[in-house]
Structure formats: C-alpha cells, structure tokens
Interface confidence: low
C-alpha cells in the first residue's frame, strides 16, 4: 500500500491522543534504554510503511502484536485516514485469523514495540521548533 495520500496530521493526532499511551502501557516496566533503535524511516509515507510492517507482520519470536490495543488503534487510524487502505487489508486479516491467538509478551516483542515507538516519534517529528 502507498501511504503517500494519507492525512498525516489526523494520524499524528490519533497517535498523540491514544496510540502513544498504549505503546507506553505495553512497554511498562521496560527501561527506555534497554533496546537500541535499529529501524528508521525517512519520510512520513515511509514511516507508515515501516509501522504497518512491524505492527501487523509476524516476525520470528513475535507473532502476537496485531491483537494489541495499540495495533487495533493503528489499524483503525490507517483505515480512516488512508484512502483505500482497508481494501488492501482484507486478505491480511483473513491470514491473521488463522494464526494462534495465544498472547505471549516475549522480549522480542518488547524490542519490536520499542522500534515502533521510535518510528512513531520520527513520523511525528516537528517541522520547526516552537520559539
């Protein structure tokens, strides 16, 4: 999916108001310095591409993020503010239902969510500092 035509300010607002807090809740008890950020993004569409990938694509050692509160809210924000996004996710959703639903918060998942926090911070980078 090409995220170029999303309403970035609306997605930013959704992140600031709720998704960010859910990410913090998920990471509670983890030191902010525990994981190094190894994933980055270089513009807003690119950030959303990486955020979608880390949030919804199962990876080795962490297959359970898609059911988390921050993930569901992320999916809702993308569906609302990115034209045509919902249609591209139908097949992905069907595949997701076939995976195990057992929820396990592994260290790998914590590391992955730490990367997500970094990507979201990059997405929300201010244009200019406030005077």
């Amino acid at each position: 999916y090409d995220f170029t035509n999303c309403d970035f300010e609306k997605i930013k607002a959704a992140y600031l108001s709720t998704i960010s807090k859910d990410l913090i809740t998920y990471m509670s008890g983890t030191k902010s310095t525990e994981f190094n950020n190894t994933v980055s993004c270089s513009n807003r569409p690119h950030c959303l591409t990486e955020i979608q990938s880390l949030t919804f694509n199962p990876t080795a050692g962490c297959a359970s993020l898609a059911k988390e509160m921050f993930a569901m809210k992320t999916k809702a924000a993308l569906a609302i503010w990115c034209p045509g996004y919902s249609e591209t996710q139908i097949n992905a959703t069907q595949a997701m239902k076939k995976r195990r639903k057992r929820k396990v918060t592994t260290n790998k998942c914590l590391e992955q969510v730490s990367q997500l926090q970094g990507l979201w911070r990059r997405f929300n980078r201010p244009l200019l500092k406030q005077q």
Epitope: S42, N43, R44, P45, H46, R125, L127, L128, Q130, Q131
Partner: antibody, heavy 122, light 108 residues
Amino acid sequence: QMQLVESGGGVVQPGRSLTLSCAASGFAFRTYGMHWVRQAPGKGLEWVGVIWYDGSATHYADSVKGRFTITRDNSKNTLNLQMNSLRAEDTAVYYCVRAPQWYLTAEAFDLWGQGTMVTVSS
Amino acid sequence: SYVLTQPPSVSVAPGETATITCGGALIGSRLVHWYQQKPGQAPVLVIYDDSDRPSRIPERFSGSNIGNTATLTISDVEAGDEADYYCQVWDHSSNTYVFGGGTKLTVL
C-alpha cells in the same frame, strides 16, 4: 553498506554545460531527499539544491537558480545535476548528499559522497 | 537570507574542552546540525537537531542551542579531532539550507 558515488566531474570552459551523476546503494533511495552541496577550493560548504524524495519538487540556491537542474531516477537509484552556463565561480568539489525528507524540514545531511571536482576555466 | 557566523579558528590543548559557536538571529528557534570535515575528506555529521549524536560519534561531542547562539562542545579533545567544523540550519523563509563559514579546530 550505504554509499553515494559521484561521477562526471572535470574541466569545462565558461558558458558550457556539464552533468554530474550520483549512484546510491545500500539504502532506500526513493524515500530520501537528495541534495547537492559544493565546496570551492579552500572555502566553506555551500548548499546547491535539493530534490524531494519522489521528485515532485526541487529548490535551489540563488547562486545557481535558472542554471542548474536536479533530477533523479528512483528506479535506478541515481541522482543528476545538470549544470548550464557555467562560471568560474562554480569551480568546486560537488558532493551528493542524502537527507531524510520531511516536507520542507530541517533534516541533517546524514550521508555524503566522496565528491567530484568541477573546474570551470578557459 | 539567513546568516550563520562562526569563529574562523579555535585552538585547544589535548585533553581540554573545545567550544565552537555558531551565531544567528534567534537560532535557538531553529534546528542546528554540525559537521566535521578533515582535509581531503567529505564532511561527516557529528551533531543533529541541536544536541543529538549519530551512533558512531563519540560521547565527547555534544551540542546546545539557545537564544542567538548554538554551540558544539568537544570534551577531552584528541589530535584526531583536528578538522573544520560547520554548523547548518534550514532557512524556512527562503526554503534554503545555510552553512556557517566553518571553524578550523587546531589541537596544540
């Protein structure tokens, strides 16, 4: 590894044209804004211009506006600088530079090529 | 257009702290980046967004930006730090990128 390699430099007469190229590798070229920065012999750095990550916009320093044109081919990971009506004061090392693209924002130049020398002389 | 002013040169003994300034009108309201350039080499980013450090840059390098002056500080200076240092900002009024004139750091 991430790399930018410039080519096309050389000696050219005043008023003539020259095209510099930059080959990018090791990173997602199509997601980055790309700049040209130059440095005259013994002088400081001077920003030349930028092209947005998707090629939709370009911006130039006043000193080269109307004479220089930046283009890119994201399918080939290449950046070009077309320099017309060259002047002696355009003599410099030209660097191809990468910067994250945030829609006209103040991002740092986080990856530089090794530079290519352009000499404008009769 | 926006102007950045740097001292042409700064000298410091090994092990001491070097301070390089970059002056500009209300520069504290802008994001400042610093580059190191050694003779015959391309510049390297050493500080971005006023005070952030790329992962490969030693902790000895730090930055600050307030009021009309941005500052690059290099503590426990080594001979290998000898180079030209440039500050840079984005001028949003003209949509151009501006470099300071550069400061030559000499390690005595």
